[in-house]
């Protein structure tokens, strides 16, 4: 299984994130038997916090730091299991991991986004 | 891999000042904003400053007009200023670059009243 992120995806403050996580499969989506994972770290060598889970429905964990923010915006059977974060803060930045099983399927897909949360640089001053 | 290392924390009485060092093992001018969290017990970490490669600052609210992010680029150093110290902003210090693949253990901030 081959999963397809951008390595970083740079959204400015205050603002909506797409976080793009697509898959390719040599078999259909069951979604029976197919499994998503979303996790969130704040650093490297963080632990991961879960807070998406797919298990024949979407499961939202709602984790404390999300808040209400996070909404699946993927589509399985179209091998798309993206996600929305709304209202992007300086604390969302970090590393989100997307893992994915899709029986018969032995291999975990993986794929690990960089989110950098960009600050609005102050307008520059008129020297005149 | 960079190694973040911050120093500069300790107890300090409300109304004081610390000056808190991050300094990081390779340069720094790759990295477009270095950024400093707080994290006190039992609550998620808040975001504190930031700077940008090109000196840009930002700031969350409650620390606007007390602290002051700078970076030293010649040192690989990012400082964080704070005056005006009140008990609320106790908790442990940390920096972070970029995009939260690196970060440091931290050093602890006190603000007795």
């Known amino acids: 299984m081959e999963v397809t992120v951008p390595a970083t995806l740079n959204v400015l403050n205050g603002s909506d994130a797409r976080l793009p996580c697509t898959f390719n499969s040599c078999y259909t989506v069951n979604h029976k038997q197919f499994s998503l994972n979303w996790t969130y770290q704040e650093c490297n060598n963080c632990s991961e916090e879960m807070f998406l889970q797919f298990r024949m429905k979407i499961i939202n964990l709602k984790l404390e730091r999300f808040q209400d923010r996070v909404e699946f915006s993927g589509n399985p059977s179209k091998y798309d299991v993206s996600v929305m974060l709304r209202n992007v803060q300086p604390e969302d930045e970090g590393i989100y991991n997307c893992y994915i099983m899709n029986p018969p399927d032995r291999h975990r897909g993986h794929g690990k986004i960089h989110l950098q949360v960009l600050m609005e640089e102050p307008p520059e001053r008129d020297s005149t | 891999e960079v190694q973040l290392v911050e120093s500069g924390g300790g107890l300090v009485q409300a109304g004081g000042s610390l000056r808190l060092s991050c300094a990081a093992s390779k340069s720094i001018l790759s990295f477009a904003y270095m950024r400093w969290y707080r994290q006190a017990p039992g609550k998620q970490r808040e975001f504190v400053a930031s700077?940008?490669?090109?000196?840009?600052?930002s700031y969350t609210d409650s620390v606007k007009g007390r602290f002051t992010i700078s970076r030293d680029n010649a040192k690989n150093t990012v400082y964080l200023q704070m005056n005006s110290l009140k008990p609320e902003d106790t908790a442990v210090y940390y920096c972070s670059a970029p995009a939260g693949q690196y970060r440091g253990q931290g050093t602890l901030v006190t603000v007795s009243s």
């Open positions: 700077i940008a490669i090109g000196g840009a600052t």
